[in-house]
């Protein structure tokens, strides 16, 4: 009788070990997606719907750090551009540096040559100020180079290895950004 | 299938607040992107707000900095708060969803009327 409670204790002692190092894992995964909250949602989603896919980006997607990045193959307006990034969750592109606009220009000249891409930057229309798509501002050394002398509404695109600007409804490729996914393994 | 259901809507003074909800059918987690369209009479139907799946955010130039849009992952919702409502704000709002495949899901729209 002693011999049978002495091993259910020690089952059970197993049992709380194992909760005990799951409890542990689980608060290691949550401290991590607190400390990269950005990438965390991205992570889950990869999680929830493609649990077996550990490509960080889609098929025709260019990887750099924790983004990804397709280079469309149609012209559109800006407007255009920003719907058909997001129907692909992602937005226009947001240049948050230059190490990452660096790596933008050099992926371009690869792929196409000197052509003109929207990114998600437009020019206030009361302020004059530009705003990337979320509404922040672009770094002082993000600015386009030329101010658009067009009376309508002005947003930015990349050329080369530089920022500029143009009216709005001009017709150009587009770059798209969206969170690379961290594998689950 | 994605079925969306918009609320909200309603008539309200220049420079009044409202705040649209958008229920999704689905987990909202597992879809590309949710949007906001607006639709006002005699004009194109026009892009408010998107959020995406993994949580970027874009506005429309018109309404930057006067609504935010957001979601609640738990309970299937995107929202849209509209903030210094403008008369030109006036419009049907339409909240669409975008799957894995960019296949878009409509709602059937809420009124919004900014009076002056």
């Known amino acids: 009788k002693l011999l049978q409670v002495s091993t259910i204790a020690m089952q059970q002692q197993e049992k709380l070990i194992q909760q005990e190092r799951a409890l542990l894992n689980f608060t290691e995964w949550k401290r991590s997606c607190a400390l990269q909250m950005k990438y965390c949602q991205a992570f889950m989603q990869n999680s929830l719907s493609s649990a077996h896919n550990s490509s960080p980006c889609p098929n025709n997607w260019i990887q750099n750090r924790e983004s990804c990045y397709y280079v469309s193959e149609i012209w559109s307006i800006w407007h255009t551009s920003q719907e058909n990034c997001l129907k692909e969750g992602s937005t226009l592109l947001q240049i948050e540096s230059k190490e990452e606009m660096d790596f933008i220009t050099g992926s371009l000249r690869k792929i196409k040559g000197s052509y003109d891409y929207w990114v998600g930057l437009s020019q206030d229309g009361h302020s004059g100020r530009w705003l990337w798509q979320d509404g922040s501002s672009p770094s002082p050394g993000l600015l386009p180079a030329e101010r658009s002398q067009s009376a309508n509404q002005v947003c930015g695109y990349v050329k080369s290895n530089s920022l500029l600007s143009s009216n709005c409804s001009t017709w150009k490729y587009f770059i798209c950004e969206k969170y690379a996914l961290r594998s689950s393994v | 299938q994605v079925q969306l259901q918009e609320s909200g809507g309603g008539l309200v003074q220049a420079g009044g607040s409202l705040r649209l909800s958008c229920a999704a059918s689905?987990?909202?987690?597992?879809?590309?992107?949710m949007a906001w369209y607006r639709e006002a009479p005699g004009k194109q139907r026009e892009l408010v707000a998107g959020?995406?799946?993994?949580?970027?955010?874009t506005y429309a130039n018109s309404v930057r900095g006067r609504f935010t849009v957001s979601r609640d992952i738990a309970k299937s919702t995107a929202y849209l708060q509209m903030n210094t409502l403008k008369p030109e704000d006036t419009a049907v709002y339409y909240c669409?969803?975008?799957?894995?495949?960019?296949?878009?899901?409509w709602g059937q729209g809420t009124q919004v009327t900014v009076s002056s």
């Open positions: 959020i995406t799946g993994g949580g970027q955010i």
């Open positions: 669409a969803a975008y799957d894995r495949s960019a296949t878009p899901y």
């Open positions: 689905v987990n909202i987690g597992t879809l590309n992107s």
